[in-house]
């Protein structure tokens, strides 16, 4: 996350890390005891969970193993529509004031909705400084017409956009997969950006998860 | 300072395989930030991107020579190599590696510019 | 495939001058287009990266614009050593990244 802060300790309980051996690969968030939402390029053979801590790394979090994970059939890693990926857990997490699950949206939010993103993604570009507490940022919803002036036809249908016009606060590599919650519902998966992270009225680029909701809630039912 | 060198032999006979090795001096090939990028040129002529491959070994081959290209990475010795069989004339150029840096974060990572170059090892086809 | 069209091939001009090159995407590429410079022998240098981003150590009289299909590389004030040949390479919707024809600089 660059230009965000120090997130309030335990209030992101949902914010999960994907783990390549002990390094970060990838945020995540958690929306059943069994399973956990992230970003479609975030595909990896296997992955470590963290959950329940604030603090990258730290030995007291709960870790467990994912051996499966199911892209959304959609995924193009040419246009990168449905950049959208749960991951099934080995074996079921164990709930707790620092370890809830997200609530999935009923309705997609409008443009002007005040949300928060998070992750322990480089905090400075191009140079990197992987933080080991997690990060945050306000940012506010872009509508569709207002993203397509910067990003033009690489923006997709269900790809949403948040920024703070003439800020640099944005998100960055490590954050993918992470979660955007607005009014308290998880409204987007950090996808994509341009590099250096954090140029001013470059708006971040999240999948829009109000549109896939369908879809995870029978991908997770199909794969109990 | 991060070095690209080509190494290999400059003459290959048709329908044989060309060989080459990129060798990195002052970085690591094992960074996920970045592609490991082939590209050539022919005698006179403008850039042609053969091929690239990332941190995870996978790769991504220009259509035109798909068929005959294979590119590898040996993260203990800190090269990435590329082969290119059944060689003819056309094949005649200059072989550059060289570091491709991400232009985008996430999704986008695979948008990229090539920062570093190796100097160029010419390679000629002929019997 | 996206071709990318370069304008002109060559061109002269005299140390001082300004000169501008274009490079037209056949479809939409966004502002993911980078500039390069090639001395005869020697290895292409990266210019300009997202179409407009200087690179690190490169001169201030160079500078580029455009965004969608069509892009400008500028050069303020032609310099002795900025005699050379100069592509433009657009990096999404690989493979295969693609590059343009090349434009060559020279001394008028």
């Known amino acids: 996350i660059i230009d965000g802060y120090k997130c309030k300790e335990g209030s992101h309980p949902w914010q999960v890390a994907l783990l390549k051996g002990n390094q970060l690969h990838c945020g995540g968030v958690l929306v059943d005891k069994y399973w956990v939402l992230t970003a479609a390029h975030c595909k990896m053979g296997q992955y470590q969970v963290q959950l329940g801590s604030d603090k990258i790394g730290d030995q007291s979090a709960q870790k467990i193993k994912a051996t499966k994970s199911f892209r959304h059939p959609g995924y193009s890693t040419k246009t990168h529509v449905n950049d959208i990926m749960l991951v099934r857990l080995d074996e079921p997490v164990k709930m707790s004031s620092k370890v809830e699950a997200v609530q999935l949206p009923e309705h997609c939010e409008p443009p002007g909705t005040s949300c928060t993103v998070s992750g322990w993604g480089t905090t400075t570009s191009p140079d990197v400084t992987f933080p080991s507490d997690l990060m945050c940022s306000d940012v506010k919803l872009i509508s569709s017409r207002e993203c397509k002036k910067v990003y033009k036809d690489l923006l997709g249908k269900t790809m949403l956009c948040a920024g703070i016009p003439d800020s640099k606060t944005n998100t960055c590599n490590g954050d993918s997969g992470g979660p955007l919650v607005c009014n308290d519902t998880l409204q987007g998966l950090v996808s994509w950006g341009t590099y250096p992270c954090g140029q001013p009225n470059d708006p971040g680029v999240y999948t829009q998860v109000c549109k896939y909701k369908r879809w995870v809630m029978e991908t997770m039912k199909t794969h109990r | 300072q991060l070095q690209l060198q080509e190494s290999g032999p400059g003459l290959v006979k048709p329908s044989e395989t060309l060989s080459l090795t990129c060798t990195v001096s002052?970085?690591?090939?094992?960074?996920?930030?970045?592609?490991w990028v082939w590209i050539r040129q022919p005698p006179g002529k403008g850039l042609e991107w053969i091929g690239s491959?990332?941190?995870?070994?996978?790769?991504y081959y220009n259509p035109s020579l798909k068929s005959r290209v294979t590119i590898s990475v040996d993260t203990s010795k800190n090269q990435f190599s590329l082969k290119l069989s059944s060689v003819t004339a056309a094949d005649t150029a200059v072989y550059y590696c060289?570091?491709?840096?991400?232009?985008?974060?996430?999704?986008?990572?695979?948008?990229?510019?090539?920062?570093?170059w190796g100097q160029g090892t010419t390679v000629t086809v002929s019997s | 495939d996206i071709q990318m069209t370069q304008s002109p091939s060559s061109l002269s001009a005299s140390v001082g001058d300004r000169v501008t090159i274009t490079c037209r995407a056949s479809?939409?590429?966004?502002?993911?287009l980078n500039w390069y410079q090639q001395k005869p022998g020697k290895a292409p240098k990266l210019l300009i990266y997202?179409?407009?981003s200087l690179q690190s150590g490169v001169p201030s009289r160079f500078s580029g614009s455009g965004s969608g299909t069509d892009f400008t590389l500028t050069i303020s004030s032609l310099q002795p050593e900025d005699f050379a040949t100069y592509y433009c390479?657009?990096?999404?919707?690989?493979?295969?990244?693609?590059f343009g024809g090349g434009t060559k600089v020279e001394i008028k």
């Open positions: 491959i990332d941190y995870f070994a996978s790769t």
């Open positions: 479809q939409s590429i966004s502002s993911y």
């Open positions: 390479q657009q990096s999404p919707y690989f493979p295969p990244l693609t």
């Open positions: 002052g970085g690591s090939i094992s960074s996920d930030d970045y592609y």
């Open positions: 997202s179409a407009s």
């Open positions: 060289a570091r491709g840096r991400p232009l985008g974060y996430g999704a986008r990572h695979d948008y990229y510019g090539m920062d570093v």
